[in-house]
Interface confidence: low
Amino acid sequence: SEGRKTWRRRGQQPPPPPRTEAAPAAGQPVESFPLDFTAVEGNMDSFMAQVKSLAQSLYPCSAQQLNEDLRLHLLLDTSVTCNDGSPAGYYLKESRGSRRWLLFLEGGWYCFNRENCDSRYDTMRRLMSSRDWPRTRTGTGILSSQPEENPYWWNANMVFIPYCSSDVWSGASSKSEKNEYAFMGALIIQEVVRELLGRGLSGAKVLLLAGSSAGGTGVLLNVDRVAEQLEKLGYPAIQVRGLADSGWFLDNKQYRHTDCVDTITCAPTEAIRRGIRYWNGVVPERCRRQFQEGEEWNCFFGYKVYPTLRCPVFVVQWLFDEAQLTVDNVHLTGQPVQEGLRLYIQNLGRELRHTLKDVPASFAPACLSHEIIIRSHWTDVQVKGTSLPRALHCWDRSLHDSHKASKTPLKGCPVHLVDSCPWPHCNPSCPTVRDQFTGQEMNVAQFLMHMGFDMQTVAQPQGLEPSELLGMLSNGS
C-alpha cells in the first residue's frame, strides 16, 4: 500500500495449518482432452452456462468443495528459504480428478545489493519473508477454478509459489554470516516440485510452469531444469511446459541513461549483471554454454534464452510493457509526450514484435500494460479475434502427445498472435488506460492524443479519415 514500485506484490500469514497429505495419484481417472470450443465460439455465454449447470449438477458426486482458496504449505525442508531465512512455501488447491498441474511463479522486481535489499525488506517484506503470509489465497485468472473466469484450465491442480527470494527465481545461495540474505529462487522451485510429487504430482500428465513479470522470466530460467529434475527422479512421462507472462524483456538502450543507483533506474543489463553475482544466480545450462564466463546475464533475456530451451514455452508479452518502460526510464506523467519519446515507444513495440517473430506460441497485444494471466479479466483481451485462453487451448492441442510444437498450425486454432498495428492501444480490446498522474481512466482517443499521436498520422495507415478513426476508437470497436 505505501509507496510501492513493484511488479507484483502479495501475501502474509501466521503459522501454517496442519498438513493433510494428499492421497497418491495412482488409479486416477484418465483425463479427457481439453474441450474444443471451435463449434461453440459464436455462443460462448450459452455454452458456459451449460458447463456451469453441468458442474453444479455433478457437485454432489464430488468430494471437492467448490472453494476458490489455495492453502499455504510451508516447505518441510526449512533449509530452503526466503531472503530472511524464513521457510519458503507454496499455496495449493488440489483437483483430484485432474492430471494437469499449474505451478505459478509470482513476480515482484528484484534487489541486487545490500542497500536496495535492505530498502526492499523495509517496504515490501512479503517479497522477502514468509513470516506473515496468509493461510489462504484466492485463485484468480488462470489460477481460478471457475470455468467462466478460467475457460482454459479451470479443473487443474493449482499451485501458487510466492516470490520471496528477490532474485528473479535464479538464486542458489543460502543465508550465512557473510550473506545477510539468502537467494534461493531456483532451489525453491526444485523443492516445491519435490514436495508436490508426494501430493499427487507424481501422477501428472502435464506440468505447466507459469509466471508473471519476474516470475515470467523465472519460467524461462527454470522450465528445462524442472523437466530434467522430473526425469532424474523417475517421472519422464510428465510433460513440462512453460507459460511466461510479462517476463520477456529487452536489453535495449534506455530512453534516458541513468546511473545504476536503485532497482528502478538501473539499466536491466547492469542490474542483472550485478544481481547474478550477488545471488549466485544459475541459468539454463544450454544457454550458459553459449556465453562466456561472466556473461550469463544474457540468459535473463527471453530472446536470447528461448532458442536454447527444450521444453515448449508459450510467451505472453504486452508490446508496450510498463515494467520495460520503467527500466528504460520512460515515465508517462500528466504531461503530453514529446516527439522523441513517442518514437522511442513505437520503436520499442517494433523491436519486441521482431523478437517474437520466431516464437511459434506467443500472444502479444499492442497495449500499454503489465501482467495478464492472473487478472480476473484475462479472457477479455484478443489479438486478431483470438483470446489468450483460446490461444492456450490451441497450443495444448498442437502439443498433444508431443513435446515439440507441431510445424503446421491447426486450422482455425492459431497460436502465434502478435499485434501488427504500430502504436499503444491500437488494439481495441486493450485494458483501460489510466493517466498515471491523476489516476483517471482515459478513452483511447484521449490517450493517443496525450501520447502525442497526430490523428492524421494514425488514421492514414488504416485507410481512414481522422474523424472515422476517432469515432471507431471512442466506440471501442
Epitope: 500500500s1 505505501e2 502479495r10 501475501g11 502474509q12 530498502s119 523495509d122 517496504t123 496468509p134 487478472r375
Partner: antibody
C-alpha cells in the same frame, strides 16, 4: 508478551499542543510499520497517521496533515505523535497499533490514551 | 478515500444462532488474489481486537465460530453459533490503499 502502551493524553485548550508516546515491548519494534488511530466519544474508528519500520514512509489523514507529526525511535522502541493547533474535534481516545507486515491490518493495539480539547 | 458501508447498524440474534454482518466498499479492495478487508471486535472500554484478516483468515486465538468471506467490494463476517460474550461492536477495515478506513460499526445484541 507483545504490548503497546500509550501515554501523554491530557486536557488541552483549542490551539494548544500535545505529544503522545507509545512504548513497545515483546517484539522486534524495528521490524514493524506503526500507526496512530483514534476514536471520538461514542464514534467509530479513524486512522490518523502511519510510519514505516525504517521511517522512510510517513503518511497522514488529510484533516491532520500539517498539524500532526509521527516519528519513532527504534533504539528506544517508542512511537510518538506530536499534535499542534488542536481543535475540539480532535477529542478522542488515541491508540497506537502495529501494522502487520504487509497486510495493512492492525494485529496489536495499545490500550489507548485520552486527549480532550476544550476551553 | 474508499468508503466502507457496514450493515446493519445493529443486530439482535438469539443465542446459538448465526449473526451475519456485511461490509460494502465504494471500490474494489481486492488485488491479485488478495482481499484487503479485515474485521475487528471492540468491547466497551477496550481497544479493538483483530478477528479476521485478508477477508477470510482467522487470527490465531480467535474461535472458529468467527468466519469471513467475500472479495471485490462485498464482504461478510459470520458468527455461528453466537455466544453471550459476542454481544459488542464489530468493525470492518480495508487496507487496499492509504488511507485505511473503517466501517461505521455494527452493534450485536444477544437475546
Amino acid at each position: 508478551e507483545v504490548q503497546l502502551v500509550e501515554s501523554g493524553g491530557d486536557l488541552v485548550k483549542p490551539g494548544g499542543s500535545l505529544k503522545l508516546s507509545c512504548a513497545a515491548s515483546g517484539f522486534t519494534f524495528s521490524d514493524y510499520g506503526m500507526h496512530w488511530l483514534r476514536q471520538a466519544p461514542e464514534k467509530g474508528l479513524e486512522w490518523v497517521a502511519y510510519i514505516s519500520s525504517g521511517s522512510t514512509t510517513l503518511s497522514y489523514a488529510n484533516t491532520m496533515k500539517g498539524r500532526f507529526t509521527i516519528s519513532r525511535d527504534n533504539a528506544k522502541k517508542t512511537l510518538s505523535l506530536q499534535m499542534t493547533s488542536l481543535r475540539s474535534e480532535d477529542t478522542a481516545i488515541y491508540y497506537c497499533a502495529r501494522k502487520n507486515y504487509n497486510g495493512g491490518y492492525f494485529d496489536v493495539w495499545g490500550t489507548g490514551t485520552t486527549v480532550t480539547v476544550s476551553s | 478515500d474508499i468508503v466502507l458501508t457496514q450493515s446493519p447498524a445493529s443486530l439482535v440474534v438469539s443465542l446459538g444462532q448465526r449473526a451475519t454482518i456485511s461490509c460494502r466498499a465504494s471500490k474494489s479492495v481486492s488485488e491479485s488474489g488478495y482481499s484487503y478487508m479485515h474485521w475487528y471486535q471492540q468491547k466497551p472500554g477496550q481497544p479493538p481486537k483483530l478477528l479476521i484478516y485478508l477477508a477470510s483468515n482467522l487470527e490465531s486465538g480467535v474461535p472458529a465460530r468467527f468466519s469471513g468471506s467475500g472479495s471485490g467490494t462485498d464482504f461478510t463476517l459470520n458468527i455461528h453459533p453466537v455466544e453471550e460474550g459476542d454481544a459488542t461492536t464489530y468493525y470492518c477495515q480495508h487496507s487496499r490503499v492509504l488511507p485505511p478506513t473503517f466501517g461505521s460499526g455494527t452493534k450485536l445484541e444477544i437475546k
